[in-house]
Interface confidence: low
């Protein structure tokens, strides 16, 4: 079973609603871990959840807490709690083959669609995560720049695959 | 009774929810009619509703239409319909003392809170509108620059007064 898998709840519907409810041209800052789309998840997941937690916490500050229904605030608040749980879980499992990327995360601006595609990819990593082989290398080819990471911004419309 | 008053519906609750559901630092472009906060409403209302219609239509394009509940899209769509009705009504009443501002509207950036305060002020104008006195002047004092208009961003927290 994937490490920390029990911390991941099914929030696909909420995230889809959140993306639809954010301006398409609004930019969200995220310190993106280079190579997350070409390297195995154990190479980047521990850093990525920390960065997602920071970005979602900042995003939460941009909204007012209104009581009724599924507001952006309430959805983001829920996502912050999920990611913060994963941050804790990663700390607990830090010896279990979760490696540090050799490259520092770089602050970049993402549209909501791009940001939550990265969020979803990170959540998926916990679902699929199995203890990695020690031989699995965490080096990005020097010819691949972070901007060329293939899944950051794809041409397909935003559809989230199932999370759990 | 105010001109076009029957076109105005009570959307206070929706607008309050919309403002809470937009990022506080998101900027909305509006061609702001200089002097709208220091001149009588008949001086600026005909232009202001046209500009609000354009801005809200642009804003609508930034969101996806999701069927469930009160989404940002559904609220903005409702506001566009209200304002478009008012644009039509203003055209019908264009001879009824609704004057053209001598200054062209200027494109400016507003936070959601600022933008919807202007929106609300414009909606209120229809509620209160009585046929204006011909002697009522539509000239902004040359000592007052548009930037000094006092009600664009007031010190009270965002609370919309009743509209209709």
């Amino acid at each position: 079973e994937g490490i920390c898998r029990n911390r991941v709840t099914n929030n696909v519907k909420d995230v889809t609603k959140l993306v639809a409810n954010l301006p398409k041209d609004y930019m969200i800052t995220l310190k993106y871990v280079p190579g997350m789309d070409v390297l195995p998840s154990h190479c980047w997941i521990s850093e990525m959840v920390v960065q997602l937690s920071d970005s979602l916490t900042d995003l939460l500050d941009k909204f007012s807490n209104i009581s009724e229904g599924l507001s952006n605030y309430s959805i983001i608040d829920k996502l912050v709690n999920i990611v913060d749980d994963l941050v804790e879980c990663v700390k607990e499992n830090s010896s279990k083959d979760l490696k540090k990327s050799f490259k520092s995360p770089e602050p970049r601006l993402f549209t909501p669609e791009e940001f939550f595609r990265i969020f979803n990819r990170s959540i998926d990593a916990f679902k699929d995560f199995a203890v990695a082989s020690e031989t699995s290398d965490c080096v990005v080819s020097s010819t691949l720049s972070p901007e060329k990471d293939s899944r950051v911004s794809v041409t397909k419309p935003f559809m989230l695959p199932p999370v759990a | 009774e105010g001109i076009c008053r029957n076109r105005v519906t009570n959307n206070v609750k929706d607008v309050t929810k919309l403002v809470a559901n937009l990022p506080k630092d998101y900027m909305i472009t509006l061609k702001y009619v200089p002097g709208m906060d220091v001149l009588p409403s008949h001086c600026w209302i005909s232009e202001m509703v046209v500009q609000l219609s354009d801005s809200l239509t642009d804003l609508l394009d930034k969101f996806s239409n999701i069927s469930e509940g009160l989404s940002n899209y559904s609220i903005i769509d409702k506001l566009v319909n209200i304002v478009d009705d008012l644009v039509e009504c203003v055209k019908e009443n264009s001879s009824k003392d609704l004057k053209k501002s001598f200054k062209s509207p200027e494109p400016r950036l507003f936070t959601p809170e600022e933008f919807f305060r202007i929106f609300n002020r414009s909606i209120d104008a229809f509620k209160d509108f009585a046929v204006a006195s011909e002697t009522s002047d539509c000239v902004v004092s040359s000592t007052l620059s548009p930037e000094k208009d006092s009600r664009v961003s007031v010190t009270k927290p965002f609370m919309l007064p009743p509209v209709a």
Epitope: L109 | D25, M27, L109, T111, S150, K156, P157
Partner: antibody, heavy 115, light 105 residues
């Protein structure tokens, strides 16, 4: 815009900067603090909406600095706690116009953090 | 991030001077250009990428959108020797370029 409150303070100390505004409707404008370390470029520090309801901070000062305003006194404030040597700079207050640019600046006040 | 180039330049009175600013991400038109003289506060020259601020001489002009922006001084005057900064202020956090110092040749 006239800043005041700068001076020499020890690392870990606190300081409160003020910016007195006149000549415009203060409550209609978002305001910012921008700083400039000696011989260096400009760095945005913090911003506050016209009503004071929304505040924003640069990562370098988040949790240590607090921006506030008193619209009845036409005054902007920056409360600086846990000061570090790298906070040494001239601090400017600036008005954000409706085009989201800084169109009016104060003359600046020097903050020196040193033991 | 905003990257300005060059970091400094030497020019003569009457020269045409061009300074460029590149944003790491598209910032629409939310770009301003500021002039700063030693010991003084910055002064807004150009707002919304290409609009001339009131009271600024027409020899200053701005252009560009998205990620690439340019400040041009058509005919450099003695009072124009200063440091120039670009700033992206449409999104938080507001970011300034590192500055371009225009010196007398």
């Amino acid at each position: 815009l006239v800043e005041s409150g700068g001076g020499l303070v020890q690392p870990g100390g606190s300081l409160r900067l003020s910016c007195a505004a006149s000549g415009f409707t203060f409550s209609s404008y978002a305001m910012s603090w921008v700083r400039q370390a000696p011989g260096k470029g400009l760095e945005w520090v913090s911003a506050i909406s016209g009503s004071g309801g929304s505040t924003y901070y640069a990562d370098s000062v988040k949790g240590r600095f607090t921006i506030s305003r008193d619209n009845s006194k036409n005054t902007l404030y920056l409360q600086m706690n846990s000061l570090r040597a790298e906070d040494t700079a001239v601090y400017y207050c600036a008005r954000r116009d409706f085009f989201a640019h800084f169109d009016v600046w104060g003359q600046g006040t020097l903050v020196t953090v040193s033991s | 991030q905003m990257t300005q180039s060059p970091s400094s330049l030497s020019a003569s009175v009457g020269d045409r001077v061009t300074i460029t600013c590149r944003a790491s991400q598209g910032i629409r038109g939310y770009l301003g250009w500021y002039q700063q003289k030693p010991g003084k506060a910055p002064k807004l020259l150009i707002y919304s990428a290409s609009s001339l601020q009131s009271g600024v001489p027409s020899r200053f002009s701005g252009s560009g959108s998205g990620t690439d922006f340019t400040l041009t001084i058509s005919s450099l005057q003695p009072e124009d020797f200063a440091t120039y900064y670009c700033a992206g202020t449409g999104f938080m956090p507001y970011t300034f370029g590192q500055g371009t110092k225009v010196e007398i040749k």
